[in-house]
Each structure stands twice: as C-alpha cells, then as structure tokens.
C-alpha cells in the first residue's frame, strides 16, 4: 500500500506557497487529483513527487496515490486546501447535467476548512430550493 508524505490527512497552505507531495510504494505509483495548474511531476521508480512553488486556490482538492501493480489495490490520499480569502470556492464545473429525479453532484470545493461549518445551498438570486430537495455536503 503506498504512503504519502507529508503524513497528514489534510494540508492547509497559503496562496503562493511551495507544496511538495511525495508518494512511495513497493512498485511504481501514480497520482490522481483535480486538474489544476502549476504542478510538476517527478517520478523515480517506486517514488513519485508532485510539486508546485506557487500554489493557488485551484490546487485545492484530494490527491490520491495508487500502486497499479498492487494486487490489493490499496491507495493513499491527502486533501490540500489553498486558503485564499478572495477565493473561498474552487468550482470544478460551471454546468452539471442530470436526469430528472436523480441525485446531482455539484463539484464545488472549499479552499478553507474553517468555512465548512457555515455552508448552505441557495439558488441564484436567493430563490428557495425546489420542494422535496434534500442536500448534503461531503
């Protein structure tokens, strides 16, 4: 099972920070994360490093490392917050298409974990949500 350094589940940094994420496995490893700018990838056998010297709010998200050759299929993850007061959200999509009566996933990431307690969902121009709409955040 691969291991990520730094060895924390969450990493909170300021915009412009240098961030280094290292994944080590027994065999070759691969990174999966939000499509975002400024990352440089260095791979060396069983180690892979994601690095940026100019983190932005767009780098906010969960970065997962997997070892394709691992029969157990284990993975490791770290969630990065780039805490930008001017950009509380990292919106990953401008439009989401769903079928009627099905669940909709709105991919919208907070850049600061402190804001999580005060999040609610409203429609544009403050109109109330449609009746029978249940929503939750993950």
């Amino acid at each position: 099972i691969p291991v990520i350094e730094p060895s924390v589940p969450e990493l909170v940094v300021k915009p412009g920070a240098t961030v280094t994420l290292r994944c080590v496995g027994n065999g070759s490893v691969e990174w999966d994360g939000p499509p975002s700018p400024h990352w440089t990838l260095y791979s060396d056998g069983s180690s892979s490093i994601l690095s940026t010297n100019n983190a932005t709010f767009q780098n906010t998200g969960t970065y997962r490392c997997t070892e394709p050759g691992d029969p157990l299929g284990g993975s490791a993850a770290i969630h990065l917050y780039v805490k930008d007061p001017a950009r509380p959200w990292n919106v990953l999509a401008q439009e989401v298409v769903v079928f009627e009566d099905q669940d909709a996933l709105l991919p919208c990431l907070l850049t600061d974990p402190v804001l999580e307690a005060g999040v609610s969902l409203v429609r544009v121009r403050g109109r109330p949500l449609m009746r029978h709409t249940n929503y939750s955040f993950s």
Partner: antibody, heavy 118, light 107 residues
C-alpha cells in the same frame, strides 16, 4: 467540541502488560487518524504509534522503540482507539496522550500515566 | 529517521519582549513542521502547522517561518500566558519526531 479521554494507566512491573484506551467524541471518528504520544522528563515528547482511517486501510505505524511490543487498534463503532503494551520496560514510563491528526496533532487528551517499576 | 534539534533549551524573558525559537531538521522536511505550546501540568496545544499557518484561535503575536531544514517560531510582545514549553515536530513521514523543547520562563 472535540474530546479525547484516555484511561488504563497505572503501575506495572517490568515485563508486564497494560492496555490503554481513548474514548473520542465531537467529530467523525471513523474518518480520523489517531496517534499515541508519550512524555517523560528523560525523553521529552515522543511519538509512539499511529492508526489511520478505513479509507487509508487502517494502516499502522510505530516508533522503533516500541515496534513488536506495542499494538495500536481502533473500534470505529465505539469511537475508541487502544494501545496494547507488552514486555514493558522502565523507559516506557510516562504520560500517554491520545491525539487526533488533521493538519498536525490538532487535539490532545488529558493523558494517562504509566509507571513501569518493580 | 529525521532528527529535530531545537534551541535554545531554555529562555528567561520579560513580559513585552520578543522571542524567537529555532528548530533544525536533519534533512529537508518541505515545510511540514508543527509547533506546540505546553503549559505546566497541561496537554500540548497546536500553535502552528505547515511551518507558517496559525492554528484556529492562536493570537497573531505568534508567527512561524522557515523552509527546507531551518524553521523558527517568533512570539512578539510576550504575554504572561505565553510562558511554558514549546516543541517543534515534523510531519514528513514517520516516525514523527519532536524537538527537545524550549522552556520559556519569566525573568
């Protein structure tokens, strides 16, 4: 409010065993990484062991000084983490803290004292 | 294993002074450093994470800096409640070693 409460400390003879418990509340325990840290006047603060969340395969890690003697485990249904300590030595004496890892050791319990002495 | 060397071991200062505590890692820890404050008879409390980020509720007179192997914690205009012990700790893999601590005493 996050709360961590350790129990199970006491006096034990060298070579003996002891199990520490930590009861957690105020957060989603099953998502949390949990660690044990100990403190003594001789060694200062010393990281002991870690157990990660189910999403991280409940992976465990140990300090070299306790490897093979201590076992960290968790029961997500009881929001509790445990430290089974065997083959105890006098140098294992100290205050044992249960901690939650987020961006660092964000929350600490009040500690439970273990004394290993004959 | 990464070793953390903290200095000074103790410091005698007056209220209102500014102090700086330093921590050196034996190898690059890429800013993955935390600082803790511990008051007599109490559990440690997180002050700073990722080298420069203040934990929730920590007064702005505290600040962390550094990169690579060299890090510091600065306390401006010391208040009486700031006296106690301070520890650094790295999070670049395991084992997660702590510095030896700095005891801040009132002059």
């Amino acid at each position: 409010e996050v709360k961590l409460e350790e129990s199970g400390g006491g006096l034990v003879q060298p070579g003996g065993s002891m199990k520490l418990s930590c009861a957690a509340s105020g957060f989603t325990f099953s998502d949390a990484w949990m660690d044990w840290v100990r403190q003594s006047p001789e060694m200062g603060l010393e990281w002991v062991a870690e157990i990660r969340s189910k999403a991280n395969n409940h992976a465990t890690f140990y300090a070299e000084s306790v490897k093979g003697r201590f076992t960290i485990s968790r029961d997500d249904s009881k929001s509790s983490v445990y430290l089974q300590m065997n083959s105890l030595r006098p140098e294992d004496t100290g205050i044992y803290y249960c901690t939650r890892v987020k961006v660092g050791f964000d929350n600490w319990g009040q500690g439970t004292t273990l004394t290993v002495s004959s | 294993d990464i070793q953390m060397t903290q200095s000074p071991a103790s410091l005698s200062v007056s209220v209102g002074e500014t102090v700086t505590i330093t921590c050196r890692a034996s190898e690059n820890i890429y800013s993955n450093l935390a600082w803790y404050q511990q008051k007599q008879g109490k559990s440690p409390q997180l002050l700073v994470h990722a080298a420069t980020n203040l934990a929730d509720g920590v007064p702005s007179r505290f600040s962390g800096s550094g990169s690579g192997t060299q890090y510091s914690l600065k306390i401006n205009s010391l208040q009486s409640e700031d006296f106690g012990s301070y520890y650094c700790q790295h999070f670049w893999g395991t084992p997660r070693t702590f510095g030896g601590g700095t005891k801040l005493e009132i002059k």
